[in-house]
Interface confidence: low
């Protein structure tokens, strides 16, 4: 039934979205001298052009290509950290281990992190009321397509040993439907990537199980091995201790903090 205004199932565009994107861009380019010459007004124009006046269930990766081009960035391909359902710890880690990068440590990931956005077909309005939900409405919405696009490119750029942080507290430690499971795993390049090393983060303080033996980790190992990439897995039993040891690696109590379980 045609409606005057489409009501979607998900939250609307983040308030002050244009100002936030522009301000984040300016901040990022100031903090990262190698990106200082990115023109943030052009970046915002390209971002806006990807979804404004377009039906929010009919967005394609092509819509984001002008933004991808403007946001082209070289990160060390052997210093990439992927994550799934454990973003905060991954970001805490790269804040300490400054030579490693999550997607949100790149310009485009930083711009969009935690934001929601969508437009309306045939109007230049941003929809602050509601945006499509991936499950209940449609998968080809502006936010989902953005993350699929940048995640694919990020995974394609990776080389040597790629690390992924996984949440050991979840029923599916590796989830085929996550961005990592559905996009990044399948876009690692076997000719460049030698090993995927999973870090399984434990939640409970008394949890001493070897979560590298979890069936979903075995499933991940199988997918990766079929792609001619080696797989390795480590339990991070105490994430707080792990972060402390990253900060102070010379601490004598840190030698056994990461427990190795290698699979090839």
């Amino acid at each position: 039934v045609p409606r005057w205004r489409q009501q979607w199932s998900g939250p609307g565009t983040t308030k002050r979205f244009p100002e936030t994107v522009l301000a984040r861009c300016v901040k990022y380019t100031e903090i990262h001298p190698e990106m200082r010459h990115v023109d943030c007004q052009s970046v915002w124009d390209a971002f806006k052009g990807a979804f404004i006046s377009k039906h929010p269930c009919n967005i394609t990766e092509e819509d984001y290509q002008p933004l991808m081009k403007l946001g082209t960035q070289t990160v060390p391909c052997n210093k990439i950290l992927l994550w799934s359902r454990i973003k905060d710890l991954a970001h805490q880690f790269t804040q300490v281990q400054r030579d490693m990068f999550t997607l949100e440590d790149t310009l485009l990931g930083y711009l969009a992190d935690d934001l929601t956005w969508c437009g309306e077909f045939n109007t230049s309005k941003i929809n602050y009321q509601s945006c499509p939900d991936w499950r209940k409405d449609c998968s080809n919405n502006p936010v989902s397509v953005f993350w699929k696009t940048v995640s694919r490119r990020f995974a394609e750029a990776a080389c040597d040993v790629v690390h992924v942080m996984l949440n050991g507290s979840r029923s599916k430690i590796f989830d085929k439907n996550s961005t990592f499971g559905s996009v990044e795993v399948h876009n690692l390049q076997p000719e460049k990537v030698q090993t995927l090393e999973a870090w399984v983060i434990h939640g409970g303080r008394e949890d001493s199980r070897d979560l590298c033996q979890d069936p979903t980790i075995k499933e991940l190992e199988s997918i990766i091995s079929k792609r001619n990439i080696q797989f390795s897995c480590k339990n991070i039993y105490r994430p707080d201790k792990f972060l402390q040891c990253v900060k102070n690696p010379e601490d004598s109590s840190c030698t056994s903090e990461i427990h190795h379980h290698h699979h090839h």
């Epitope: 522009l22 861009c25 300016v26 903090i31 010459h37 023109d39 915002w44 081009k69 082209t72």
Partner: antibody, heavy 120, light 111 residues
Framework: EVQLVESGGGLVQPGGSLRLSCAAS????????MHWVRQAPGKGLEWIAF????????YYVDKVKGRFTISRDNAKNTLYLQMTSLRAEDTAVYYC?????????????WGQGTTVTVSS | DIVLTQSPASLAVSLGERATINCRAS??????????MHWYQQKPGQPPKLLIY???NLESGVPARFSGSGSRTDFTLTISSLQAEDVAVYYC?????????FGGGTKVEIK
């Protein structure tokens, strides 16, 4: 209305020091990078220094490195330029300028300038 | 450092006539497909005022008789029909590399 008002200029002997201030109003100071630019009498413009919004990135032209220090106090909406070991060639009108919001290095608003004269 | 050379150093143009100022960079100021060249106007006793940013974008509030063009190393500022209030010194500036540098200026007068 955006306003930048410089102060602190004056006559100083070679080897002396001065601290310039730039009071900002009419905009959210903490959202903008800021610069100092100078202009010697009858000469062209010369960029001196830049400071980012949170002071995490600071850049200088080589000839003032080690002698000049740019800083800011976002709570006071004020930009500073501490100048030491002053030389005759530092004589100029000193302008503070607001970095254009969407790209590093060019300036959409300037103060009226404050004059620094280095002479014995 | 990128050296910007403006020509001519001074220019006398009749009211209503076209004024053209050139700026040549010692190396390309293009990056990410954008030319990081900007133009300012400075009237006597006043601070500079931004006219054109990124080679060809007119700053808001600037009259449409001002226009900019060029890429890489060669840039032009054009005043299509000179008005009395346009008497000033005009500077080009590059922001592609630190240190940020300005041209030596072009003084525009009325003939």
């Amino acid at each position: 209305e955006v306003q930048l008002v410089e102060s602190g200029g004056g006559l100083v002997q070679p080897g002396g020091s001065l601290r310039l201030s730039c009071a900002a109003s009419g905009f959210t100071f903490s959202d903008y990078g800021m610069h100092w630019v100078r202009q010697a009498p009858g000469k062209g413009l010369e960029w001196i220094a830049f400071i980012s919004t949170g002071s995490s990135n600071i850049y200088y032209v080589d000839k003032v490195k080690g002698r000049f220090t740019i800083s800011r106090d976002n709570a006071k909406n004020t930009l500073y330029l501490q100048m030491t070991s002053l030389r005759a060639e530092d004589t100029a009108v000193y302008y503070c300028a607001r970095n254009y919001v969407s790209s590093y290095g060019y300036f959409d608003y300037w103060g009226q300038g404050t004059t620094v004269t280095v002479s014995s | 450092d990128i050296v910007l050379t403006q020509s001519p150093a001074s220019l006398a143009v009749s009211l209503g006539e076209r004024a053209t100022i050139n700026c040549r960079a010692s190396e390309s100021v293009d990056n990410y497909g954008i030319s990081f060249m900007h133009w300012y106007q400075q009237k006597p006793g006043q601070p500079p005022k931004l006219l054109i940013y990124r080679a060809s974008n007119l700053e808001s509030g600037v009259p449409a008789r001002f226009s900019g063009s060029g890429s890489r190393t060669d840039f032009t500022l054009t005043i299509s029909s000179l008005q009395a209030e346009d008497v000033a010194v005009y500077y080009c500036q590059q922001t592609n590399k630190d240190p940020l540098t300005f041209g030596g200026g072009t003084k525009v007068e009325i003939k």
